[in-house]
Interface confidence: medium
């Protein structure tokens, strides 16, 4: 029977034993920076080219005996997971191995840097198709290793790395903490985070997604036909490297940003038991398990968005946190979150010619997070419209006044320490949905975008009684671009997007009391792009794209407004 | 790649002509920073990656490395250039005493210096 891990990453609509996508990554070269490998193993023979690159430190301990099978163990297994004949993810992918880890699985940052430089020079000397670099290693946070990864990613290389096996925040490790790298945590056959002895998979905002990483059957270096089970975030990263190779083989022109968004989009959502993670990390950790797309044709017609959390601001009164999108992504909305509820909102601002999302801590607050909604929107022209705090009791409002611009997100930022002492705004006037409304003490920021065929609608869900969490989701075919709360009172801890759902969190019910002050509305802005759909149809002909126009016609834009007990 | 070392005489001239103080301060008072691994057992003191500012050319990297060696030698310290980076990041990898960090951070073109550290199979 098929190994559990290969079944898990296979799209649900196919039986795994029937599903073998064409070319299985054959247009892609995967570089593996790891231990030495047994290149004549039956699983990988002829698929892996061993480069002459070697940069490893001396093994520790005077009694260490270098045994070939032990030296090759880690790298051989991973090469098998990526491209092995029987147990590999991308059976058509060719690989190149660089030795940066010694027989004890130890290497250096400098050796890894020189390895990455070697790859870049090889790429310049002999440009090939898409490149994937697998880094199944981790060290402490390293500015220089992250910088090198960033440079290589900006040269068009896809880097995939292990989140780390330290049962800790992945942001404390490198290259896991490099934003440009696709960082992978490990889950098991039960979709639970992997425990490894007293430790386990890393977690947190620096993890992009999880993948199978426990009891993974793959090539063993004990003999040329041997197999062995290994566990770790390296194995998980190898799965994602294989999936990336498959996707890039099907769509060689995919950018790193497009690939990352697709990996997130096609992942299984909300299957991981978050109780395994420390409480403060649960909201930051993506509940995503990697899977192959259901067809080798990408979903070019989709508007893809992902949520990017900032680092924690720290507790000082004027502390801020900044969340950034990747260079090829558009920041379509910005929200904030504070566990204590003491925050001064958030705003979108330009930094180095690009919009960023900045959240502001408040006096007595333990700190805030900024949450960016980062989307792929080709030919987009986005700007931020700001309204200063209003004098009128109706609250502050701002709309997208430029022709053809649609509202994709609302943010609000205030200077007063506690909005709770001020009355919230009254009902939003009907018939003017394309605007942001906020507290009269707050400045309001509207993200307004023009892109071919972009259309958006506002969806709200209000709860009259105080509740710790209010959610509102976008329907099938629509993508969540904006997530915010009404009203902006102090018992709201913040708002953030989880996949296609807008989540508004409030203070514990017991502390709020059930006054009308407790009413909370989650506001989602849902968008889609007709332009992307049409472009996709033209690309794919009438086979896989048929009927998209009919679907769009059937879903005429309606502005859904569900107001519940606003006082 | 071969180290474009220039004439050794250039190094000796540098030894004789440079003032006895520290290396000239980086331009516009921007201070280079030193980084090391937060996990002590993973640190590898004695080997450092000297990262130079983004637009630094290979020849400048090599010149900066030579300058460090010359100034270190005047203070009785040995330095060994293990690699000159170009292609991804400009800079060089050097074996030297940690006592030289203050001097190295003041070299022109230096952006930051990071002490080498261990990485592990996961």
């Amino acid at each position: 029977s098929i190994p559990w891990n290969l079944e898990r990453i296979t799209p649900p609509r196919y039986r795994a034993d029937e599903y073998q996508p064409p070319d299985g990554g054959s247009l892609v070269e995967v570089y593996l920076l790891d231990t030495s490998i047994q290149s004549d193993h039956r699983e990988i023979e002829g698929r892996v080219m061993v480069t002459d690159f070697e940069n490893v430190p001396e093994e520790d301990g005077t009694r260490f005996h270098r045994q070939a099978s032990k030296c090759d163990s880690h790298g051989t297994h991973l090469a098998g997971v990526v491209s092995g004949r029987d147990a590999g993810v991308a059976k058509g992918a060719s690989m190149r191995s660089l030795r940066v880890l010694n027989c004890q699985g130890k290497g250096t940052v400098s050796g890894t840097l020189i390895g990455l430089e070697f790859i870049r020079k090889s790429q310049l000397v002999q440009p090939v198709g898409p490149l994937v670099v697998l880094l199944p290693l981790a060290g402490g946070y390293s500015r220089v290793l992250n910088a090198a990864c960033q440079r290589l990613a900006r040269a068009g290389v896809v880097l995939v790395t292990a989140a780390g096996n330290f049962r800790d925040d992945a942001c404390l490790y490198s290259p896991a903490s490099a934003p440009e790298v696709i960082t992978v945590g490990a889950t098991n056959a039960q979709d639970q985070p992997v425990t490894l002895g007293t430790l386990g998979t890393n977690f947190g905002r620096c993890v992009d997604l999880f993948a199978p990483g426990e009891d993974i059957i793959g090539a063993s270096s004990d003999c040329s036909t041997c197999f062995v089970s290994q566990s770790g975030t390296s194995q998980a990263a190898a799965h994602v490297a294989g999936i990336a190779a498959m996707m890039l083989s099907a769509e060689p022109e995919l950018t790193l940003a497009e690939l990352r968004q697709r990996l997130i989009h096609f992942s299984a959502k909300d299957v991981i038991n978050e109780a395994w993670f420390p409480e403060d990390q649960r909201v930051l950790t993506p509940n995503l398990v990697a899977a192959l797309p259901p067809s080798t044709h990408g979903a070019g017609w989709q508007l893809f968005c992902r949520t990017v959390w900032s680092a924690h601001s720290g507790p000082t009164r004027m502390a801020t946190a900044v969340a950034r999108c990747a260079p090829d992504e558009e920041l379509l909305s910005c929200s904030s979150f504070s566990r204590s509820g003491k925050r001064r909102g958030e705003r979108m601002e330009a930094q180095g010619g690009k919009l960023v999302c900045r959240a502001h801590n408040a006096f007595g607050g333990e700190g805030v997070y900024a949450i960016a909604r980062c989307c792929l929107l080709p030919q987009a022209n986005c700007s931020v419209h700001t309204a200063p705090p209003a004098e009128a009791s109706m609250g502050t409002r701002v709309h997208c006044h430029q022709q053809g611009h649609v509202l994709t997100g609302c943010s609000s930022h205030w200077e007063v320490e506690d909005l709770g002492t001020h009355k919230p705004p009254v009902l939003r006037p009907r018939g003017q949905p394309n605007q942001c409304v906020g507290h009269r003490e707050a400045s309001i920021h509207a993200s307004c975008c023009h892109a071919p065929g972009l259309e958006c609608k506002v969806k709200e869900h209000g709860i009259p009684a105080p509740q710790e969490q209010v959610t509102v989701a976008c329907e099938e075919g629509w993508t969540l671009t904006g997530c915010s709360a009404l009203p902006g009172t102090s018992h709201v801890l913040g708002a953030y997007a989880v996949d296609n759902t807008c989540v508004v969190r409030s203070r514990d019910v017991s502390t709020t009391g059930s006054t009308s002050e407790g009413a909370v509305t989650a506001v989602a802005i849902c968008c889609r792009s007709r332009h992307l759909a049409q472009a996709s149809q033209e690309l794919q002909g009438s086979t896989s794209g048929s009927g998209l126009n009919d679907i769009f016609e059937a879903q005429k834009i309606e502005w859904h407004e569900h107001h519940h007990h606003h006082h | 790649q071969e180290d474009e070392d220039g004439d050794y005489e250039e190094l000796v001239l540098a030894l004789r002509s440079e003032e006895d103080g520290l290396a000239e301060a980086p331009e516009h008072g921007t201070t280079a920073t030193f980084h090391r691994c937060a996990k002590d057992p993973w640190r590898l003191p004695g080997t450092y990656v000297v990262v130079l500012k983004e637009e630094t050319h290979l020849s400048q990297s090599e010149r900066t490395a030579r300058r460090l060696q010359a100034q270190a030698a005047r203070r009785g310290y040995l330095t060994k250039i293990l690699h000159v980076f170009h292609g991804l990041l400009p800079g060089f990898l050097v074996k030297m005493s940690g006592d030289l960090l203050e001097l190295a951070l003041k070299l022109p073109h230096v952006d930051y210096i990071e002490e080498d550290s261990s990485v592990f199979a996961q």
Epitope: I114 | D3, G76, K80, L82, H83
Partner: antibody, heavy 121, light 107 residues
């Protein structure tokens, strides 16, 4: 045990090139720089340069810079030194040596047995 | 290049003698000096590093001293196996130059 084993003696004509190999064993080859030193008959030792096998970075004595090439093959833990445009005064024993670095001390702790290169018409 | 001038170029001594070899650097090399022993037809062997540190396995009769420009290798009580040529080397600056050698012969 740690050792460096060099290739056998060579006899070359002036203007030719010679490539001497140095095979390392008993330690991690890429963990140490390999230096090349030569000794003309009855003379002292002359440093030619070094290679860092882990990155292929090389540094040469100016005297040899235009004629020497240092390479390595990590798969067989071997370093190579090639000297071109040979002259009769290149007749010497060529040694490879491993450099050990401790803090602010360094030295050549392991030497190859030497390769005699004779340049004669 | 830094010139290492070694003296004497040769000396004759008997077993049990105290032998001193000196090496003078043309400029300050601090303590970056190593001493090697070479027997005919053999490769050099490390004795002393960083001017005064005895290498592992080297008998205690060998000692080194000096800093700056003047360095000394001393054999406190010459043994039959010590008859060889001795070289100093500076590692302070590239190129890493050697002294001309001192041949210690049996008197």
């Amino acid at each position: 045990q740690v050792q460096l084993v060099q290739s056998g003696a060579e006899v070359k004509k002036p203007g030719a090139s010679v490539k001497v190999s140095c095979k390392a064993s008993g330690y991690t080859f890429t963990g140490y720089t390999i230096h090349w030193v030569r000794q003309a008959p009855g003379q002292g030792l002359e440093w030619m340069g070094y290679i860092n096998p882990s990155s292929t970075y090389t540094k040469f004595n100016q005297k040899f810079k235009d004629r020497v090439t240092m390479t390595r093959d990590t798969s067989i833990s071997t370093a190579y030194m090639e000297l071109s445009r040979l002259r009769s005064d290149d007749t010497a024993v060529y040694y490879c040596a491993r450099e050990r670095i401790y803090s602010n001390y360094w030295f050549f702790d392991v030497w190859g047995q030497g390769t005699t290169v004779t340049v004669s018409s | 290049d830094i010139v290492m001038t070694q003296s004497p170029s040769s000396l004759s001594a008997s077993v049990g003698d105290r032998v001193t070899i000196t090496c003078k650097a043309s400029q300050n090399v601090y303590t970056a000096v190593a001493w090697y022993q070479q027997k005919p037809g053999k490769s050099p062997k490390l004795l002393i590093y960083s001017a005064s540190n005895r290498y592992t396995g080297v008998p205690s009769r060998f000692s080194g001293s000096g800093s700056g420009t003047d360095f000394t290798l001393t054999i406190s009580s010459l043994q039959p196996e010590d008859f060889a040529t001795y070289f100093c080397q500076q590692l302070s600056s590239s190129p890493e130059t050697f002294g001309g050698g001192t041949k210690v012969e049996i008197k």
